[in-house]
Amino acid sequence: ITRQSLDPQRRAAPQQKRSSPTEGLCPPGHHISEDSRECISCKYGQDYSTHWNDFLFCLRCTKCDSGEVEVNSCTTTRNTVCQCEEGTFREEDSPEICRKCRTGCPRGMVKVKDCTPWSDIECVHKESGTKHTGEVPAVEKTVTTSPGTPASPCS
């Protein structure tokens, strides 16, 4: 850990940027020391802080789960960005798991949008053009294919 001190007597190592808390805060990529006198740098690839802060530690980098791909690696100022693998997507209401995209649309419907890491395929009725989410209204008794089943958990 690089400690950046208020003490002017301490010599900085070559190429080491020195900083001390500014109005009680440390810059992105750092956290404050327990005595609030120093800004301590986060460890690259291990932890991070994204904004000016007085955190007592840097936050741990996220590790992408199986079923996810790493889009951006963790830096001292930015967390890892993980994305669902091809053929799976993350729903807003259950962001912890990547769900399998449906492979096709029910009879009488056409696909208007492909599967993305953020959304399932989108189907519309051929005639009316109304959307179909894969959920069957309670009054309908027709047999339909079930929506995608969860892939491996994302956390």
Epitope: G24, I32, E34, S36, N53, D54, F55, L56, F57, L59, R60, S155
Partner: nanobody, 126 residues
Framework: EVQLVESGGGLVQPGGSLRLSCAAS?????RYWMYWVRQAPGKGLEW???????????YYRDSVRGRFTISRDNFKNTLYLQMNSLKSEDTAVYYC???????????????????GAQGTQVTVSS
């Protein structure tokens, strides 16, 4: 009503071990970060350890890292602190606390102990 009840403290010799527990009720335990803080005689509150809501990320102050282990059971609504290789400087009243996010210097500095809070006394002495 939010309730946090600490237990497990006691008198132990240097080098000994204790396991503290904190039973939580009155809030959705699994949604909150949890901390252990302590207050030594005549001193202010000092942050000891923190754990995120899911329990996957744990953090420690330098003086306890490698000796203390924080953990939580979100089904039992309980927070734990396993304390090994105890030293005389660990003597304090230990409290658990809930929070929306990771601890900050300003948050710990302005933290106060509720009048009804008991804490659990840890005394390390030979």
């Amino acid at each position: 009503e939010v309730q946090l009840v600490e237990s497990g403290g006691g008198l132990v010799q240097p080098g000994g071990s204790l396991r503290l527990s904190c039973a939580a009720s009155g809030f959705t335990f699994s949604r909150y970060w949890m901390y252990w803080v302590r207050q030594a005689p005549g001193k202010g509150l000092e942050w000891v350890s923190a754990i995120n809501s899911g329990g996957g990320d744990t953090y420690y102050r330098d003086s306890v890292r490698g000796r203390f282990t924080i953990s939580r059971d979100n089904f039992k609504n309980t927070l734990y602190l396993q304390m090994n290789s105890l030293k005389s400087e660990d003597t304090a009243v230990y409290y658990c606390a809930k929070a929306e996010g990771p601890p900050t210097f300003s948050l710990i500095r302005t933290m106060t102990v509720d009048p009804g809070a008991q804490g659990t006394q840890v005394t390390v002495s030979s």
